[in-house]
């Protein structure tokens, strides 16, 4: 079905359209049950309740209503370039016999959760497989979704972005069963250049693809590792040229700062990956802000003048909760001739594997 | 309807910093990106970048990363652009747009005059 | 960043003529391609977005095509009021623009 909400212009800013399905555990006399249901034809937006966002707000929100006291709320939020469902929450009424018969107690309950819909800004987001958002002894399932918040003129944008689940997946392989991790592993990250400049001319050349690995611990007490890959298209890099420090500053999606330091030894004349530092936000967690650093490493190391290369994947440790997994790596600091790289020096890891 | 009135023209000296406003009305002020371009006649049309004034999130070009900053009050639904260090080349006209990325529904300021001379 | 080349930096054209311009971005922009008039004195002016969307009001004698990286803007029954400044813009990733192509009418 298709629910829109609309401003006082008679403006739409939220357009969806799909069918949902609710999975709900409770408890009858004889003891627990689960009731599945779909959402009704009859479902309607809650006008009153439903927002386009106030002044000075950002959080237009749809509210769905039905049978007897139902509501599937979604809540929005976003970014300077994404947006994104932040909140799902569904509130039901075990007093509703028609849903929930034998229900021993007749109280209304809600249950929220965050979830993965979100979409760059002026695309739709678009889902045909079911998206599954799992609430305490609720299960939402949307099919067949087609959702887009802050609309320009009132229609569903020609471009979209897709769901993780609908995208190919590079290797067919059996179902998993669903896995309490917010996000699925994703694939290896795209390799990028990067380069920072000085007024003495480059003083960083790098290519690499870069995954963070994070742990930490979310609302609901769980603990969750989530690894998420840098994406280069939305991402812009900087940097500063030191005698003794080089530095490459990434600002990707989410507010996300990934900051890498190499440092040299003048003795020996060798460069190396020195410190690296994160700040980035987690919506999930139970301290959303989430920030690692370490300025004590040893990494990527290679005589000035000559560039490290490593095809294989390298785990840099940074803390206890968080690594970065480099891909193809290929990088030179401090010395850098003709803004090309130098003579390779190759990892152990590739030359084990010749 | 949707209107940017931006601050009016400026005369400043190399080295300097200029701060230039841009207060929007006739829509919810943190709906949408504001971006800034500047137009001059030796280099053109260049983006510099874009604040969302819901949470202060502010992309910038590379090229203007390290001299602009974005800022945006909610309060009075005005968004400002500091540059600084400034040289005779940053002599054009700069305007904010009303976008979030797609550009079909974009509404263009009047354009701020910055000229840099000793 | 994504860089668009534009070419050429200038071209001149007779009254009822044809000119055509290309933008080429440095990676795949997914049709996110718009393109603007420019005239001194004045703001610039929305003609083509999508890649081949007209802006309405603007007259069928503008038109605009391409996929990937490869793009191109059309002018055609040229008309004096044609002179000025056209800059091609790519939206997919940030905002980039051309560097923009001075036309002249012979």
């Known amino acids: 079905a298709m629910f829109i909400v609309k401003n006082g212009n008679g403006t739409a800013c939220i357009m969806a359209n799909f069918s949902a399905a609710f999975s709900v555990n409770y408890d009858t006399k004889s003891g627990p049950k689960n009731m599945t249901f779909d959402l009704p034809s009859d479902a309607k937006v809650v006008l009153n309740s439903s927002s386009c966002g106030k002044e000075n707000t950002s959080d237009p929100s749809l509210v769905i209503a039905f049978g007897r006291g139902q509501t599937l709320t979604l809540n929005f939020t976003r970014n300077a370039t994404r947006y994104s469902v932040q909140l799902m929450s569904f509130v039901y009424n075990l007093s509703d016999t028609h849903l929930f018969p034998n229900a021993s107690s007749k109280e209304i309950k809600t249950v929220e959760s965050i979830t993965d819909i979100r979409a760059d800004i002026d695309k739709k987001y678009r889902c045909v497989s079911g998206t599954q958002v799992h609430m305490n002894n609720v299960t939402v399932t949307l099919h067949d979704a087609t959702i887009q918040a802050y609309l320009s003129n009132s229609s569903f944008s020609r471009e979209e972005t897709r769901c993780e689940q609908d995208r190919p997946s590079p290797t067919t392989a059996p179902p998993a069963p669903p896995s309490p991790s917010p996000s699925p592993v994703p694939e290896s990250p795209s390799v990028d250049k990067y380069n920072v400049s000085g007024t003495n001319g480059t003083c960083l050349l790098a290519s690499m693809g870069l995954q963070l690995n994070l742990t930490y611990e979310r609302k609901d007490n769980t603990t969750v590792t989530r690894l998420l890959n840098i994406n280069p298209n939305k991402t812009l890099a900087s940097g500063s040229c030191g005698a003794h420090l080089v530095t490459l500053e990434l600002h990707s999606e989410g507010s996300t700062v990934l900051l890498f330091q190499f440092g040299m030894n003048a003795s020996s004349s060798r460069f190396f990956l020195q410190g690296i530092q994160l700040n980035t936000t987690l919506p999930d967690a139970r301290d959303p802000a989430f920030k690692a650093a370490n300025s004590s490493l040893r990494a990527l190391q290679a005589t000035v003048g000559n560039s490290y290369k490593c095809n294989a994947e390298e785990h840099v440790r940074v803390t206890k909760a968080f690594s970065v997994n480099i891909f193809k790596v290929w990088v030179q600091a401090f010395k850098v001739e003709g803004g090309q790289f130098g003579s390779v020096e190759e990892c152990l890891l590739d030359e084990n594997n010749m | 309807q949707v209107q940017l009135v931006q601050s009016g023209a400026e005369l400043v000296k190399p080295g300097a910093s200029v701060k230039m406003s841009c207060k929007a009305s006739?829509?919810?002020?943190?709906?949408?990106?504001i971006h800034w371009v500047k137009k001059s006649p030796g280099q053109g049309l260049e983006w510099i970048g874009a604040?969302?004034?819901?949470?202060?999130?502010?992309p910038y070009s590379q090229k203007f990363q390290d001299r602009a900053t974005l800022t945006a009050d909610t309060s009075s639904s005005t968004t400002y652009m500091e540059l600084s260090s400034l040289t005779s080349e940053d002599s054009a006209v700069y305007y904010c747009?009303?976008?979030?990325?797609?550009?079909?529904?974009?509404?263009w300021g009047q354009g701020t005059l910055v000229s840099v001379s000793s | 960043d994504i860089q668009m080349t534009q070419s050429p930096p200038s071209l001149s054209a007779s009254v009822g003529g044809k000119v055509t311009i290309t933008c080429k971005a440095s990676?795949?922009?997914?049709?996110?391609m718009a393109w603007y008039q420019d005239k001194p004195g004045k703001g610039p002016k929305l003609l083509i977005h999508?890649?081949?969307t007209l802006q309405p009001g603007i007259p069928s004698r503008f038109s605009g095509s391409g996929s990937g990286r490869d793009y191109s803007f059309s002018i055609s029954n040229l008309e004096p009021e044609d002179i000025a400044t056209y800059y091609c813009?790519?939206?997919?990733?940030?905002?980039?623009f051309g560097g923009g192509t001075k036309l002249e009418i012979k």
């Open positions: 747009v009303r976008a979030n990325w797609d550009v079909a529904f974009a509404y």
């Open positions: 006739g829509y919810i002020f943190t709906n949408y990106n």
């Open positions: 604040i969302y004034p819901g949470n202060g999130d502010a």
């Open positions: 990676q795949d922009i997914d049709r996110y």
């Open positions: 999508d890649t081949s």
């Open positions: 813009l790519q939206y997919d990733n940030l905002w980039t």
